[in-house]
């Protein structure tokens, strides 16, 4: 009971945290405009993997994306790179867990294959909030060198004569999105690992006997039980239970706060 | 086609409140835009109120701060103005906008405020 | 708040004449984010609301006559009409859409001759 709690919390944790990790991915606030020395500026800039978004003194929100691939610096190529590989990662992971979860009986599958499915899964999902976790870190690093570098020349101009406030960007929600779904993702990995120590199946070295009775040869296979299946050969009057495998695909893309023109 | 329409007392006692209205017609005023107060002094000099944003946010002009507040009735799309102890400086003519560069603007109204 | 200066506060001109107007800001209102500068000209006529004629400075309002040219950075702005109309008699603004409280400037007359 406490094999399918744990594979099954597992599950749903790195199913919540895949599920941010894609909104913190298609998310435009990676970074947004420092207000800190300019809180009256009318124009607020924000900018996310794919797109750069302006909002005006209007309301209205302006986004253009990135239409350069050559021309992005290397560093948001990497971040890109890392929350797709987390995302492709924990989309495959949450597959192969769907299939591996004990409350779900596909053919004759053995416990040992719902074990290695399920050390499998748990390891793609550390690795997918991983991947997140230094995609947003990269970002957040990148963020705080430019942001000092662009502290140490506030003001440029022609000689000092005019004044351009040089716009600073701190840190996002996207960031902390990602931060935290990478957590639940890799949390939700090593429960799967914890889980598949309980399902797998303990090996029983006990040799096959043979009785020899009196005009009957019966021989008699003690086989170990399967670790706490409740599904042996026989099933009958067992009810199995199909837990409805349901895709959430639904995962909401931040829309920015003033997208609506 | 959006149309801005304002509406209110076109002669306001000193000390009073100023409350004025603005009937947005073709545009849902909480889809989007912030949602402003402009108003024109005799001398042609003109001023940003404030406003109040799709999400019912406000931002009002310093200058103006204790005085002012914009409120919103999403049922009926309107949008308001109040102006509290209002004093003969306070006689202009007064537009609420909208759109993008504020595009849309209102006729305007004429708010005189005399004893 | 920042400080719009229009000049000159009038000008007087013949039908078919090309006019120049300025403005400048006491501050950039230039926009690293998006490399724009945001200064919006308005034209407004007796009686009627301000109508938006460019806005970023040098962007055309649709339905804008050609004749309407806005161009400058950072903080020192013009309006250029290449050739008069006599629709075109009416005070222009310059408006500072970069800081909040938006400020506008005291506004040129176009008159005619």
């Known amino acids: 009971m406490a094999v399918t709690a744990c594979q099954g919390l597992g599950f749903v944790v790195s199913l919540i945290g895949i599920a941010g990790i894609i909104a913190a991915t298609c998310m435009d606030q990676w970074s947004t405009q420092d207000l800190y020395n300019n809180p009256v500026t009318a124009v607020f800039n924000y900018q996310g993997l794919w797109r750069s978004c302006v909002r005006e003194s209007s309301g209205f929100t302006e986004c253009r994306g990135y239409f350069t691939l050559l021309g992005l610096p290397a560093m948001l190529q990497a971040v890109r790179a890392l929350m797709i590989v987390g995302i492709v990662l924990g989309a495959i992971g949450l597959l192969v867990s769907i299939f591996a979860l004990k409350c779900i009986r596909i053919g004759s599958m053995e416990d040992s294959a719902k074990a290695n499915m399920t050390l499998t899964s748990g390891i793609m999902f550390i690795v997918s909030g991983l991947c997140a976790i230094a995609g947003v870190s990269v970002f957040a690093n990148m963020l705080v060198t430019n942001f000092w570098m662009s502290t140490a020349n506030m003001y440029t101009g022609m000689g000092g004569m005019v004044q351009t406030v040089q716009t600073r960007y701190t840190f996002g929600a996207a960031l902390f999105v990602g931060w935290v779904a990478g957590g639940l993702t890799l949390i939700g990995g090593v429960m799967m690992c914890i889980a598949c120590r309980g399902l797998a199946p303990e090996e029983t070295n006990y040799k096959a006997v043979s009785y020899h009775a009196s005009g009957h040869s019966v021989a008699y296979k003690p086989g170990g039980f399967k670790a706490s299946t409740g599904f042996g050969s026989n099933t009958k009057n067992k009810k199995i239970y199909d837990g409805g495998a349901r895709t959430e695909d639904e995962v909401q893309s931040y829309p920015s706060k003033h997208d609506y023109v | 086609d959006v149309q801005l329409q304002e509406s209110g007392p076109g002669l306001v006692k000193p000390s009073q409140s100023l409350s004025l209205s603005c009937s947005v017609t073709?545009?849902?005023?909480?889809?989007?835009?912030?949602w402003t107060w402009f108003r024109q002094f005799p001398g042609n000099k003109l001023e940003w109120m404030g406003y109040i944003s799709y999400d019912g946010s406000n931002n009002y002009n310093p200058s103006l701060k204790n005085r002012i507040s914009i409120t919103r009735d999403t049922s009926k799309n309107q949008f308001f103005l109040k102006l509290n102890s209002v004093t003969t400086e306070d006689t202009a003519t007064y537009y609420c906008?909208?759109?993008?560069?504020?595009?849309?603007w209102g006729q305007g109204t004429l708010v005189t405020v005399s004893a | 708040d920042i400080v719009m200066t229009q000049s000159p506060s009038s000008l007087t001109v013949t039908t078919g004449e090309k006019v120049t107007m300025s403005c400048k800001s006491s501050q950039s209102v230039f926009n690293s984010g998006n490399q724009k500068n945001y200064l919006t000209w308005y034209q407004q006529k007796p009686g009627q609301p301000p109508k938006l004629l460019v806005y970023w400075a040098s962007t055309r309002e649709s339905g804008v006559p050609a004749r309407f040219t806005g161009s400058g950075s950072g903080t020192v702005f013009t309006l250029t009409i290449s050739s008069v109309q006599a629709e075109d008699l009416a005070v222009y603004y310059c408006?500072?859409?970069?800081?909040?409280?938006?400020?506008f400037g005291a506004g040129t007359r176009l008159e005619l001759k």
């Open positions: 408006q500072n859409d970069y800081y909040f409280p938006l400020t």
């Open positions: 073709g545009y849902s005023i909480t889809s989007g835009y912030f």
């Open positions: 906008a909208s759109f993008r560069f504020f595009a849309y």
